[in-house]
Each structure stands twice: as structure tokens, then as C-alpha cells.
Interface confidence: low
């Protein structure tokens, strides 16, 4: 009995096509874009996600210094390869022939080369600093009813497990959310920081990825959490490998 | 063998605190969520909160935020649940839970229960 | 909160016999990722709770299968095969999709 069995639909990922074709009726959801069956009960991989985004019609002083190592997601969006079991597969290439290596959750760490470019194995992104700021209030949030609705939130929507909510700092206005989760940690079942990380960044930027969900509201002690810019650093468990050019540029 | 110990019963005056203890062992304590529940005479059960000893992350009950206080000692795989400004309705037997994620945000195994009464 | 109402609060069965339990909720226990966080608990006299059905209808390690647990949405039943005198306490049905809440429990009584 699947998740997405009472009205064939998957409320974790609205990018799907259902249909009743599964083992004795059952309902069973495909990716769009790659057309791999997922799991309704828990978060989409964000490879799987990204590729469906891609095949879908366009529209129109206490906070964490990220490491020297820390990337962020300039590349944008990309038409990813995704592996049998919804991962990103190490080396990622466009139509031109341009390859590029990635990390786990899909962003580039090396510089980009050719067809003969070599990504020996997926570099697991063990360390995720979500910083967020929010759009001014009559006064600063108390630090602790943030920390604890911001845990709530990745432990009840995401279904994250605490122990990978490594911090939560708060300086008005911005706001960090530490994510930690080195693959020993990472067991069988438990959501991948780097999902639960897409699926919040949709969600704060008003473009849910449950389906018929309403959008998040976020709360703290009745006060809305309204965030006007978020910026993501990916830390790898091998740091990443650019070329001096663009370390200076 | 996972087992979770609680403390004796505590009888105590009303506006006072009280600390119950929690002593867990056939399990890695700090990979487990330890939530605490009320159970009034009535019988009814009342979640209070959790805490995750890995990292201290805890969440309550809207009704007993400012009432309970949760702390974990790691090193001696105990749990702690202090109550606050105790009156006579917070007369109950207290639940330590581990909670098991994998089987989907449940509570698999339960203390002995510490019984407490608030009286003048 | 969350409101689960049990039915009925007390049951009295003769051994052998099967027994039913109802759990009904004031929302709808389906998570957003698709779950149903719904459990029961039976709580014999004197002892404290043990579960016995987690996620509607997965038996816990050691529970016997004449307990069975199912339903959906906000309607969930507990059913008890072959009653036998173990069985004997008071049911709790509870939720962790919202806030974690209980029902009033139902209590199993031998004729």
C-alpha cells in the first residue's frame, strides 16, 4: 500500500504522473522528466526534481562564516543526469559537451572541462548553511521560539531527523540553519539534508513541491517569518577543486 | 535489552519544582528523541515534549512550554524532565518514551512511570 | 490538538472471541509526505504502555498477529483476533502527524 494509493496522486511531489498501473492496482507515481517510479512516503531526490523542473513547461557575529571551501549554486539550472536510484550521477555534461563534476546535491565542484573529464565518485555534501534573511518586524524574534518552530518545521514537514539540525543562529535579521549529515550518520530511511535543504528552499520561495499543499507559513509565537533572500553554502566532505583563475577572479 | 529507568515517586508542595530522571540502557542514548508523557488519574495521556541528546534540540506541547524543563546527561545516558510552579493539578504519573523514527515517529519503549503528588 | 476519540470506552469479550476498538480524529492523520502517523498502545493494569501497532497497521517486533490495525484519513480500528486473558487493559489510539495527541483509551474486560 503506497503512500499515493487513496486518490493516486503523491503528496510529496507534485511533479509526478500517477496512475493505478503498480502491483494489483495499486497506484504508482513516475518523476516527470525521467520517468523513474518514487517513493510517495518521503522526499523526492532533488536530482529527480531538478530534471522534472527542466522537462516542465516554462513559465515567465554569532552567524557561521562559510568555509573557504563553502560552494553556492551559481550555475543555476541544468538538466541533470540522475542515476537508478535518483542520485546525481558524479559527472554532469550539457548538450554542447561541456562536463563538469558535481557534489550530492548537484552543484558544480570542479571547473568545467570535456568529454574526457574524469568525476571518480559522487563527493557527499555533509555540510549545508542555510542563510535567510527576513523582512524587518516590529522587533527582533526571540532566538529561542525560532530555533524551535525552525526544527519543528524540518522535523514535521521534511520529516528530518533532529540530530541533522546541527545549529540554528539568529542575528536580525538573518537568520542560519546548520544542516549536518556525514554519510556514517546517514542510515537507511532517513532523509538526505540536501532534500530536505531544495524542498525548504522551494517552499520558502512560495513554490511548494507538496502536492496541494498551501504554501509554508511560517510562524513564530503568531509573528509571520517572511523571508525576502535566501542563500545556500554546500560544504563537501572532499573539498572542492577549481582552478586558481577562478579563486581569484 | 532496551530499558528506560525513572525515578521514585516524589511527593511535593504546591509552587515548588521537581526533577525526575531518566535512565536509558541497550541503546545508543543519544541517537533516540526522548519524549515525556502525562498521565492523569482519568487515565487520559498527555504528550509533554522531546529532547535529542545528540544536540539538545527539543520541542513541547504549546501547554507545558514554561512549565517543563527537559535536559539530557549524555555521559550517564539519562534524561531529565523538571517541572515548574507545581500545583495540585499537575498530580500524575510521568512517562519517559524512547521515540523511533523508523517506526515512523512513534514510542517504542516506555519507562516504569514516576508517580507525583502535589500536596500541602 | 488533535482530537482522537475512542469507541467504545470499555469492551467486555469472552476469551476466544474477537474484539474491535475504533480511533477516530479531528483531521486528517495523512502527512504531507504521505504517511500516516497513527499507533496504538496497550496499557495493562499496573504496567505502563506498550506498542503495539505503529503507522495504522505495522506490528511492532514481538507483537502477536492476532492484533491488526487499519483505516485512513480520520477512521482507524484496532481488531483483536481470538481474545485471550494477556489482552486484558486499557487500548490507546494516538497520532504524531500534528502534535502528538492521544485518545481517551478503551478498556478490555473478559466476560
Known amino acids: 500500500h503506497t503512500a499515493a494509493q487513496d486518490n493516486c496522486t503523491c503528496p510529496t511531489n507534485k511533479m509526478t504522473v500517477c496512475s493505478p498501473d503498480g502491483p494489483g492496482g495499486r497506484c504508482q507515481c513516475r518523476a516527470l522528466g525521467s520517468g523513474m517510479a518514487v517513493d510517495c512516503s518521503t522526499l523526492t531526490s532533488k536530482c529527480l526534481l531538478l530534471k522534472a523542473r527542466m522537462s516542465a513547461p516554462k513559465n515567465a557575529r554569532t552567524l557561521v562564516r562559510p568555509s573557504e571551501h563553502a560552494l553556492v549554486d551559481n550555475d543555476g539550472l541544468y538538466d541533470p543526469d540522475c542515476d537508478p536510484e535518483g542520485r546525481f550521477k558524479a559527472r554532469q555534461c550539457n548538450q554542447t559537451s561541456v562536463c563538469w563534476c558535481v557534489n550530492s546535491v548537484g552543484v558544480r565542484r570542479t571547473d568545467k572541462g570535456d568529454l574526457s573529464l574524469r568525476c571518480d565518485e559522487l563527493v557527499r555534501t555533509h555540510h549545508i548553511l542555510i542563510d535567510l534573511r527576513h523582512r524587518p518586524t516590529a522587533g527582533a524574534f526571540n532566538h529561542s521560539d525560532l530555533d524551535a518552530e525552525l526544527r519543528r518545521l524540518f522535523r514535521e514537514r521534511y520529516r528530518l531527523h533532529p540530530k541533522f539540525v546541527a545549529a540554528v543562529h539568529y542575528e536580525q535579521p538573518t537568520i542560519q540553519i546548520e544542516l549536518r549529515q556525514n554519510t556514517s550518520q546517514k542510515a537507511a530511511g532517513d532523509v538526505d539534508i540536501g532534500d530536505a535543504a531544495y524542498y525548504f528552499e522551494r517552499d520558502i520561495k512560495g513554490e511548494s513541491l507538496f502536492q496541494g499543499r498551501g504554501g509554508l507559513d511560517l510562524r513564530v509565537r503568531g509573528e509571520p517569518l517572511q523571508v525576502e533572500r535566501t542563500l545556500i553554502y554546500y560544504l563537501d566532505e572532499i573539498p572542492p577543486k577549481f582552478s586558481m583563475k577562478r579563486l581569484t577572479a | 535489552e532496551v530499558q528506560l529507568q525513572q525515578s521514585g515517586p516524589e511527593l511535593v508542595k504546591p509552587g515548588t519544582s521537581v526533577k525526575m530522571s531518566c535512565k536509558a540502557s541497550?541503546?545508543?542514548?543519544?541517537?533516540?528523541?526522548m519524549n515525556w508523557v502525562r498521565q492523569s488519574h482519568g487515565n487520559s495521556l498527555e504528550w509533554i515534549g522531546y529532547?535529542?541528546?545528540?544536540?539538545?534540540?527539543?520541542g513541547f506541547n504549546q501547554k507545558f512550554k514554561g512549565k517543563a524543563t527537559l535536559t539530557v546527561d549524555k555521559s550517564s545516558s539519562t534524561a531529565y524532565m523538571e517541572l515548574h510552579s507545581l500545583t495540585s493539578e499537575d498530580s500524575a504519573v510521568y512517562y519517559c518514551?524512547?521515540?523511533?523514527?523508523?517506526?515512523?515517529?512513534?514510542?517504542?519503549?516506555w519507562g516504569q512511570g514516576t508517580s507525583l503528588t502535589v500536596s500541602s | 490538538d488533535v482530537v482522537m476519540t475512542q469507541t467504545p470506552l470499555s469492551l467486555a469479550v469472552r476469551l476466544g472471541d474477537q474484539a474491535s476498538i475504533s480511533c477516530r480524529s479531528s483531521?486528517?492523520?495523512?502527512?504531507?509526505?504521505?504517511?500516516?502517523?497513527l499507533h496504538w498502545y496497550l496499557q495493562r493494569p499496573g504496567q505502563s504502555p506498550k506498542l503495539l501497532i505503529y503507522?495504522?497497521?505495522n506490528r511492532f517486533s514481538g507483537v502477536s498477529d492476532r492484533f491488526s490495525g487499519s483505516g485512513s484519513g480520520t477512521d482507524f480500528t484496532l481488531k483483536i483476533s481470538r481474545v485471550e486473558a494477556e489482552d486484558l487493559g486499557v487500548y490507546f489510539c494516538?497520532?504524531?502527524?500534528?502534535?502528538?495527541?492521544f485518545g481517551g483509551g478503551t478498556k478490555l474486560e473478559i466476560k
Open positions: 541497550g541503546y545508543s542514548f543519544a541517537d533516540y528523541s
Open positions: 529532547i535529542y541528546p545528540n544536540n539538545g534540540a527539543s
Open positions: 503507522k495504522v497497521s
Open positions: 483531521l486528517n492523520l495523512v502527512h504531507s509526505n504521505g504517511n500516516t502517523f
Open positions: 518514551a524512547r521515540e523511533q523514527d523508523n517506526s515512523g515517529y512513534c514510542f517504542d519503549y
Open positions: 494516538s497520532q504524531t502527524t500534528h502534535v502528538p495527541t
